[in-house]
């Protein structure tokens, strides 16, 4: 049969509220060298126990009896501390455990989860969470909106999750947890009602350097909209903004619109350029969420200036004309150049030169036409840019370089057939 237990004092019981500090104590009397006392909780050795061991000899000799006291300190009682506690010693080849003591938790309900502050769009459903536990159980919850209970009694209304179908004004929510020991009230969560996201952002009109956009405002509850904010960002090719991407790749151009009307003219844009735009509307409570980025594009415009550095020289019945691309913005893709030349008493001759920046003209009448002048204009798909000032044909002087060019015969008739999609701004000398 087993040896008699060396334990002369067993752990007591502790029951209290969270945060309580308490001590469990066991005492044993042993002969010879005192053993190390281990503590068990629910059969598991406590490896990081806050325990102290005191050993008092009862005689002069080491082999006499010793009183050993082990104290386990529980510093701030938590649910994880609850259970059955025992002391454990190894004496010789035998194992002894004390009688158990129990640690229990009992007090006001303790919140595991409380409602959090949040923003919601007006008239939009959302959920709030609240969770509390004892012991003692059961714990019944009572939700309050703006300090008004949402049920007749605790446990009768929604419990862990409160579904709110929508709000039209900023409101406060809290929850009360009730058990046999009393009531605990959660923090008060403020639910701020923001305007709904605007809808149907669309283009009303387009100009090369401006876009007119409009949108439909969302509901904003009892709070009128104060303004809407529109952002435009260049669509960086290859880095295009995805429809729902939250942040643009660069600093956006931001404009504010007074409302109503829910419309805005965005100016100072680059022509023939892709942009992404989005809009958010603001009330006294704050801004709505942004709409998704909408891809838009400014149309092409005509070149804003004439070709530069035009030179025209004449050698007998031939004229050599060359120029450089306009310095002014092209406002689109350069499709080519138009050239017009005219003598003093002759009709104007119009030519489409294409993208070349020089041409050799074969003049009629063996160069006898006097006071010949040349004008050049650049064009895009949107039409012609302004014509250059008339440049007189200078007589060619020996020593001047004159490259060999394909000769362009003057058309037999002065009329010129324009491609149907070009708009020709007629030029008069």
């Amino acid at each position: 049969q087993a040896e008699e237990s060396p334990f002369v004092g067993n752990p007591g019981n502790i029951t209290g509220a969270r945060g309580l500090t308490g001590t469990l104590r066991c005492q044993l009397q042993v002969q010879g060298e005192p053993p190390e006392v281990h503590w068990l909780r629910d059969g598991q050795i406590l490896e990081l126990a806050d325990s102290t061991q005191t050993q008092v000899p009862l005689g002069e000799d080491e082999q006499d009896d010793w009183i050993v006291v082990s104290q386990l300190r529980i510093t701030s009682l938590q649910l994880s501390d609850t259970g059955q506690y025992q002391c454990l010693v190894f004496l010789g080849h035998q194992t002894f455990v004390s009688q158990p003591g129990y640690v229990g938790l009992e007090g006001l309900p303790y919140f595991l989860e409380e409602p959090e502050d949040r923003t919601v769009a007006a008239n939009t459903p959302f959920n709030l969470s609240c969770q509390a536990q004892g012991p003692p159980e059961p714990v019944d919850l009572l939700w309050l909106q703006d300090a008004v209970p949402l049920a007749t009694a605790p446990g009768h209304g929604p419990q862990r999750s409160l579904h709110v179908p929508g709000l039209n004004k900023t409101s406060s929510f809290s929850c009360e947890a009730h058990n046999a020991k009393g009531v605990t009230t959660s923090r008060t969560a403020t639910i701020t009602v923001l305007p709904q996201q605007p809808r149907n952002l669309h283009l009303v009109s387009r100009q090369p350097t401006e876009l007119e956009v409009a949108w439909t405002p969302g509901l904003s509850g009892i709070y009128p909209l104060t303004h809407c904010t529109l952002q435009a960002v260049l669509s960086d090719d290859g880095m295009g903004i995805q429809a729902g991407e939250p942040d643009p790749p660069e600093e956006p151009l931001t404009s504010q619109a007074s409302v109503p009307p829910h419309q805005l003219r965005l100016g100072s844009l680059h022509p023939h350029t892709p942009y992404h735009i989005r809009v958010a509307c603001t009330s006294s409570q704050g801004p709505s969420s942004w709409t998704h980025w909408l891809p838009v594009e400014t149309p092409e415009g005509v070149p804003l200036g004439p070709p530069e550095n035009i030179s025209a020289t004449r050698n007998g019945s031939q004229a050599f004309v060359h120029w450089q691309e306009p310095r002014a913005p092209l406002q689109g893709t350069l499709l080519g150049y138009r050239l017009a030349y005219q003598g003093q008493d002759t009709p104007e001759v119009l030519m489409d030169i294409g993208l070349r920046q020089e041409v050799t003209l074969e003049l009629q009448g063996d160069g006898s036409v006097s006071n010949l002048t040349v004008c050049v204009a650049a064009y895009t798909a949107a039409g012609d840019g302004p014509w250059s000032l008339p440049v007189p044909l200078e007589a060619w002087r020996p020593g001047q370089a004159q490259p060999v060019h394909q000769l362009v015969k003057e058309p037999s008739t002065p009329a010129f057939s324009w491609p149907h999609h070009h708009h020709h701004h007629h030029h008069h000398h």
Epitope: A2, S5, H38, L40, Q44, I45
Partner: antibody, heavy 116, light 106 residues
Framework: QVQLVQSGAEVKKPGASVKVSCKAS????????INWVKQAPGQGLEWIGW????????KYNEKFKGRVTLTVDTSISTAYMELSRLRSDDTAVYYC?????????WGQGTLVTVSS | EIVLTQSPDFQSVTPKEKVTITCSAS?????MYWYQQKPDQSPKLLIY???NLASGVPSRFSGSGSGTDYTLTINSLEAEDAATYYC?????????FGQGTKLEIK
């Protein structure tokens, strides 16, 4: 000396229940936890749960919760493990073991075979 | 749960050799326990609280380690040591065992 003696082998059909016993001697039965451990053929060891005979308190491995019930009869220093809704993968040797934060004494094991 | 991984799974050793079995825990633990199981027998406690020899266990067995890495050492192996060895933790619930190391004597 400490001894744990288990009941004999059992053959059961799928869906049935089995109850294995473990008789303790040589120590104060109500002071020490009794654990149950499963060992499937050619496999390792898997803890099922414990019971504290002094109070009847139990703790189960989540994997076995709902199908296993641990009980004791302190008057005859015997612990029991009942396993219900038996399946073919319940075929194993089941051990009872005394624990003091680890398993210091083991029963000889009971083979439970589940076969149709 | 804490997973214990033993190394090696199998070892064939000659008598008088020194054998080392390691056990690695998936997270830090305070104590390790070691068991020996011979064919058709129940497991037997060898080492408790990492380094303490259980009653009746020969002194050629020893245990050491801390944190996540623990070792069982058998100095001068004997024929009767042919068995499967298991490590075990109970630092957190549920208690778990290693997959076992089978030791064969050449």
């Amino acid at each position: 000396q400490v001894q744990l003696v288990q009941s004999g082998a059992e053959v059961k059909k799928p869906g049935a229940s089995v109850k294995v016993s473990c008789k303790a001697s040589g120590y104060p039965f109500t002071d020490f936890y009794i654990n149950w451990v499963k060992q499937a053929p050619g496999q390792g060891l898997e803890w099922i749960g414990w019971i504290y005979p002094g109070s009847g308190n139990t703790k189960y491995n989540e994997k076995f919760k709902g199908r296993v019930t641990l009980t004791v009869d302190t008057s005859i220093s015997t612990a029991y493990m009942e396993l219900s809704r038996l399946r073919s993968d319940d075929t194993a040797v089941y051990y009872c073991a005394r624990s003091t934060g680890f398993f210091d004494y083991w029963g000889q094991g009971t083979l439970v075979t589940v076969s149709s | 749960e804490i997973v214990l991984t033993q190394s090696p799974d199998f070892q064939s050793v000659t008598p008088k050799e020194k054998v080392t079995i390691t056990c690695s825990a998936s997270s830090s633990i305070g104590y390790m326990y070691w068991y020996q199981q011979k064919p058709d027998q129940s497991p037997k406690l060898l080492i408790y609280l990492t380094s303490n020899l259980a009653s009746g266990v020969p002194s050629r067995f020893s245990g050491s380690g801390s944190g996540t890495d623990y070792t069982l050492t058998i100095n001068s192996l004997e024929a009767e040591d042919a068995a499967t060895y298991y490590c075990q933790q109970w630092s957190s619930n549920p208690p778990t065992f290693g997959q076992g190391t089978k030791l064969e004597i050449k």
